[in-house]
Amino acid sequence: GSSPRSGVLLRGCPTHCHCEPDGRMLLRVDCSDLGLSELPSNLSVFTSYLDLSMNNISQLLPNPLPSLRFLEELRLAGNALTYIPKGAFTGLYSLKVLMLQNNQLRHVPTEALQNLRSLQSLRLDANHISYVPPSCFSGLHSLRHLWLDDNALTEIPVQAFRSLSALQAMTLALNKIHHIPDYAFGNLSSLVVLHLHNNRIHSLGKKCFDGLHSLETLDLNYNNLDEFPTAIRTLSNLKELGFHSNNIRSIPEKAFVGNPSLITIHFYDNPIQFVGRSAFQHLPELRTLTLNGASQITEFPDLTGTANLESLTLTGAQISSLPQTVCNQLP
């Protein structure tokens, strides 16, 4: 049954909102999709979760959520916010998750984000952000997940990322980024997942991924690359790589020499004609390899050290004979 305390908690539930105890004597408050144009005023100080998404909130006043020191998750997605003032999140010392996606922000709200030392997850996707100031994430030392996809970025905000050494996952997909410079992510040594798909990337600095020593997933699908991304060679822990739907015409010799942990490579929908014979050597974790329409392949690929393939598809090539060792190389 409910304790006396939970009854007290529920008396602090704003009108029309749905509230329930979170199991730790704190309150989860759901005020989503109620047509609200401003924040509710009578929130319990013991609120740990507040969902204000899918409303018509167009502005936040400074310090709109006073004394919510136990608030861990704040959802403001799907509103009409164009600007978030300094002090909007003052006093939210426990805030771990902040969702601001699907608004109309044009800039990262730098001043509002300052001093959110507990913040672990920040969603800024599906806004109109075209500029990320150099110091905008400088106080977010606990940040683990950052969404900046579906915005209007034209370049990687290199300086802004320098302070995010704890970051584990980031998406910059669905922007208008055209180039990744050397050391773009140089301080992101904890990053495991990086999504860069659906941009306009046509060139990569030779050292653009240097420093990403923990990276396991890299998504470069749906870009304008016309050369194989040799910059991946420093990614020794890479497990999943996507560069399908680009304009890459050849996969060079020793293409994946620095990526011995690769399990999955997606590179379909590229006009690949040439594949170096040694391109797929020494990939012991690789399970599937599909090469369609590589018309300039005349020799069967050398799969030395790639012994766990479960599926190999070669179509449109000009291979006239199979090496005697092919059955020894495959399981």
Epitope: E155, V158, Q159, P181, G186, T234, K254
Partner: antibody, heavy 118, light 111 residues
Framework: EVQLVQSGAEVKKPGASVKVSCKAS????????IEWVRQAPGQGLEWIGE????????DYNEKFKVRVTITADTSTSTAYLELSSLRSEDTAVYYC???????????WGQGTLVTVSS | DIVMTQSPDSLAVSLGERATINCRAS??????????MHWYQQKPGQPPKLLIY???NLESGVPDRFSGSGSRTDFTLTISSLQAEDVAVYYC?????????FGQGTKVEIK
């Protein structure tokens, strides 16, 4: 602990070649560039070139391009610098270093003195 | 090639006093907001040791009396309170473009 250990001192005649080795340990060899830098007696530091071990990615200072070959063997985590057509002005301490944070040289070998003398 | 010019060539400073070394690049070494300028310390008979990377970031394990500043073409290495063990030659280096180049070095001694 990251370590770069270089081969011993060499004395060579003008026109000869020298090959200096640099054995790395304590980190993933193929994930970092190895840089080569030299220092003539009493002089400053001069960058020679770099390699990303395991790949064919190398870059050379144009000044040395025709005489220098940088290679690496990932099976032994060893990088090599070969300099041919030696002349007296190539007398120097040759260092290997790891390209670390943003390409800064964060770990260095102890250096190999190459003396070119007739 | 980018030419790196350090000043002064040598510097004598009293123990506990501030030492300042300047480095000027012949062209900007900034890219996307990062200054590709690093500082090294070299003691006699030893390889250089990284002190500062990207103009102002202290390398792990380096005492905080060392600091770096500057951008584009003009950079400074400061030792806030010189210690006896700081006697060495200090080099700046750019890796903005090949060939990577070093300054000629600044010798720091005790007055």
């Amino acid at each position: 602990e990251v370590q770069l250990v270089q081969s011993g001192a060499e004395v060579k005649k003008p026109g000869a070649s020298v090959k200096v080795s640099c054995k790395a340990s304590g980190y993933t060899f193929s994930a970092y560039w190895i840089e080569w830098v030299r220092q003539a007696p009493g002089q400053g530091l001069e960058w020679i070139g770099e390699i990303l071990p395991g790949s064919d990615s190398t870059d050379y200072n144009e000044k040395f391009k025709v005489r220098v070959t940088i290679t690496a063997d990932t099976s032994t985590s060893t990088a090599y610098l070969e300099l041919s057509s030696l002349r007296s002005e190539d007398t120097a301490v040759y260092y290997c270093a790891r390209g670390g944070h943003y390409g800064s040289l964060d770990y260095w070998g102890q250096g190999t003195l190459v003396t070119v003398s007739s | 090639d980018i030419v790196m010019t350090q000043s002064p060539d040598s510097l004598a400073v009293s123990l506990g006093e501030r030492a300042t070394i300047n480095c000027r690049a012949s062209e900007s070494v900034d890219n996307y907001g990062n200054s590709f300028m690093h500082w090294y310390q070299q003691k006699p008979g030893q390889p250089p040791k990284l002190l500062i990377y990207l103009a102002s970031n202290l390398e792990s394990g380096v005492p905080d009396r060392f600091s770096g500043s500057g951008s584009r073409t003009d950079f400074t290495l400061t030792i806030s309170s010189l210690q006896a063990e700081d006697v060495a030659v200090y080099y700046c280096q750019q890796n903005y473009e090949d060939p990577f180049t070093f300054g000629q070095g600044t010798k720091v001694e005790i007055k």
